[in-house]
């Protein structure tokens, strides 16, 4: 049976050209978490694997940062990257763990805060 | 240039164990990626089995998880595979193969070993 | 287990010929989609990762494309080497998967 619940950062804005962390965690579960990865739509953005690392798609190895953590960093940020994030969480024996978030990024310099997990 | 060579007896009883060897020249086992194993059965069908990682974690297909057991020698830049309680389906080519992390694919195989499981 | 299927078993084709061999996951696996090439008498070759993306040294009239659960795999201009088992295989998930092959073979 599933019992782990996926917290994340929810509904996120930042500004175009700064950086945004993406994070997730998995409550509520005494299962191994054998890979994480994160996805925008319908592309691959980055793997965590808990035996080998991290794996960076090549369409993003300039902008994008593993870590903190399982969490994903995302940079020189442009309008084209607002949209749907998702986290999904491998684990062993329990199955898969799907987590979601929705970026916006803001022409305006004003950005709004807030998020748990937002960069300051 | 990175290269990888299985050995091993071509010919198992069943009910005994296969153990082969993959031999590992130009890259350091313990430097990086993970170490596989991937047999071919007669018809084509290519199954993982399992890798050893360079910190010497490892992860089986669970199909096999119960028969299988992948270890190294890392004086020898060695890595082993162990399969119990063989059975004529257990026949196929084996193959090791390094999995890259950078392009998360099988980068570079060996030549094969032909292995048959009869009595 | 992700099943990863190619429902042609072989293709024929002719030289010059543009061909396109086609793989279907049973579930999405987004882009963690590789491409192997197997020559008769040989081991496999690792040609497309990540979906789209050629590995080193790999001729340009090889390419990959797809997402979710439609995978295509397109020799622009096939030579006479081109004849091989290609293959399939995601990595989404840690029980990695193979399609069961394609054979190409040349008129």
């Known amino acids: 049976m599933m019992t782990g619940t996926i917290e994340t950062t929810g509904n996120i804005s930042a500004e175009k050209g700064g950086s945004i962390i993406l994070q997730c965690h998995l409550s509520s579960t005494t299962a191994q978490v054998t890979q994480v990865n994160w996805e925008q739509q319908d592309q691959l953005l980055a793997i965590c694997n808990a035996d080998l690392g991290w794996h960076i798609s090549p369409s993003f190895k300039d902008r994008v940062a593993p870590g903190p953590g399982l969490g994903l960093t995302l940079q020189s940020l442009t309008v084209n990257d607002t949209g749907e994030y998702f986290c999904i969480y491998h684990t062993y024996p329990d199955g898969t763990y799907t987590g979601r978030i929705f970026l916006e990024v803001l022409e305006s310099s004003v950005a709004e805060h807030g998020a748990r997990f937002q960069i300051p | 240039d990175v290269q990888l060579q299985e050995s091993g007896p071509g010919l198992v009883k069943p009910s005994q164990s296969l153990s082969l060897t993959c031999t590992v020249t130009?890259?350091?086992?313990?430097?990086?990626?993970?170490w596989n194993w991937i047999r071919q059965f007669p018809g084509n069908k290519l199954e993982w089995m399992g890798y050893?990682?360079?910190?010497?974690?490892?992860s089986y297909n669970p199909s096999l998880k119960s028969r299988i057991s992948i270890t190294r020698d890392t004086s020898k830049n060695q890595f082993f595979l162990q399969l119990n309680s063989v059975t004529t389906e257990d026949t196929a080519t084996y193959y090791c193969?390094?999995?890259?992390?950078?392009?998360?694919?099988?980068?570079?195989w060996g030549q094969g070993t032909a292995v048959t499981v009869s009595s | 287990d992700i099943v990863m299927t190619q429902s042609h078993k072989f293709m024929s084709t002719s030289v010059g010929d543009r061909v396109s061999i086609t793989c279907k996951a049973s579930?999405?696996?987004?882009?963690?989609v590789a491409w192997y090439q197997q020559k008769p008498g040989q081991s496999p070759k690792l040609l497309i990762y990540?979906?789209?993306y050629r590995y080193t040294g790999v001729p340009d009239r090889f390419t990959g494309s797809g997402s979710g659960t439609d995978f295509t795999f397109t020799i622009s201009s096939v030579q006479a080497e081109d004849l091989a088992v290609y293959y399939c295989?995601?990595?989404?998930?840690?029980?990695?998967?193979f399609g069961g092959g394609t054979k190409l073979e040349i008129k």
């Open positions: 193969a390094r999995f890259m992390i950078t392009t998360f694919a099988m980068d570079y």
């Open positions: 130009g890259y350091s086992i313990t430097s990086d990626y993970a």
């Open positions: 050893i990682s360079y910190s010497g974690s490892t």
């Open positions: 579930q999405h696996v987004s882009t963690a």
């Open positions: 990540s979906a789209p």
């Open positions: 295989q995601q990595h989404y998930n840690t029980l990695w998967t």
